[in-house]
Amino acid sequence: YNVFPRTLKWSQTNLTYRIVNYTPDISHSEVEKAFRKAFKVWSDVTPLNFTRIHDGTADIMISFGTKEHGDFYPFDGPSGLLAHAFPPGPNLGGDAHFDDDETWTSSSKGYNLFIVAAHELGHSLGLDHSKDPGALMFPIYTYTGKSHFMLPDDDVQGIQSLYGPGDEDPNPKHPKTPEKCDPALSLDAITSLRGETMIFKDRFFWRLHPQQVEPELFLTKSFWPELPNHVDAAYEHPSRDLMFIFRGRKFWALNGYDIMEGYPRKISDLGFPKEVKRLSAAVHFEDTGKTLFFSGNHVWSYDDANQTMDKDYPRLIEEEFPGIGDKVDAVYEKNGYIYFFNGPIQFEYSIWSNRIVRVMPTNSLLWC
């Protein structure tokens, strides 16, 4: 997290806000609800109290405007700048302005007013942008999904560094951003994508370029807003320029940033019995047209050419790949080796000699 220079903060804990005008995109009540929820995000974790007033001057004046709107920081038309807010202080201090050339919504379409408002109010209370891609105060808009919003831990630490904690946090689970060099790091899924390596963990993935030691961390939804937050398994089909993502009983085919028509589909379409509720890992072999799927302690082999599961499968993982354990969290193939991830350990398995040749920490994939 980052606070503003000179640690600008409100000296009082009881603050007022006023919605000066409204966007035509959604109803007045939806606008009011978005701001009420956005203030609650911050009051839940601090001693701050927010009261709405209907006229006069409030500490935090909220308004919608376009282009030049009275503060010498003009908006820029659709997309680009969405909103801005001023740090705590008199006059413009604390005020939040929203660009009415955007399409404001209460859903995943356009820009979700609640998410943008919660971010802007962070500025109104004294938080600058964060470098943590998982933080609400990260400077890139990402719609986080329909389920109950949880303020990330980085933002909690930031706001509490200014105001301290509140009496009781009604939602004490604050998602943490994974640490790539955590010795206990386990992974959810790994796949290549157009020459890069994508390493999924929680609602994030690391993107690792070849010949590059420092992976970039992104929220999965910042690339693919329609995907679920968490991924069970993933693999690439390079010759078709597609990546497949699995979550629960559903799977998606992605071409770059775009979901292919007809997806998501059910994993039962691939031949999985109904007892299989989720996959844990997948890896595709371009030269043979086979894809291995892992679920529980079993492995399946799918044949691209016939579009069916190979007979004699499923088989026990321990029989097919002795020594790697009875589960696979994530898997990928490179240069004739399969890399199996099981908790904090990865196994380098030679396809040619059919045996484990190296055991390494999981986080060594991320150059730790």
């Epitope: 910042s222 320029d241 775009d258 292919m260």
Partner: nanobody
Framework: EVQLVESGGGSVQAGGSLRLSCAAS????????MNWYRQAPGKQREFVAG???????NYAVSVRGRFTISRDNAEGTGYLQMNSLKPEDTAVYYC????????WGLGTQVTVSS
Amino acid sequence: EVQLVESGGGSVQAGGSLRLSCAASGSTFSRYSMNWYRQAPGKQREFVAGISVGRITNYAVSVRGRFTISRDNAEGTGYLQMNSLKPEDTAVYYCNAGGLQGYWGLGTQVTVSS
């Protein structure tokens, strides 16, 4: 419906630069990812670079560090700045909106001679 028209192709010496443009008609351009693909004679069409609605970029390994993709939603235009061009970059370059099942331009020829 989005129509795409590429321009900016041509012939250049190895080490030179070109800037390709992709003009989109239709006001929905900003709702789609924007991508560049290329096809060399006798080869499959291959991905070159992409930029998401949220302006996150993605490059083929062979062009990373040399090519830069960008977009101007207000003007409905996408760009591919190509520096340090190599003879193996010779191909017809296609602009795409919305991925493989999306919208395609007719292409612009880029020829790099040694």
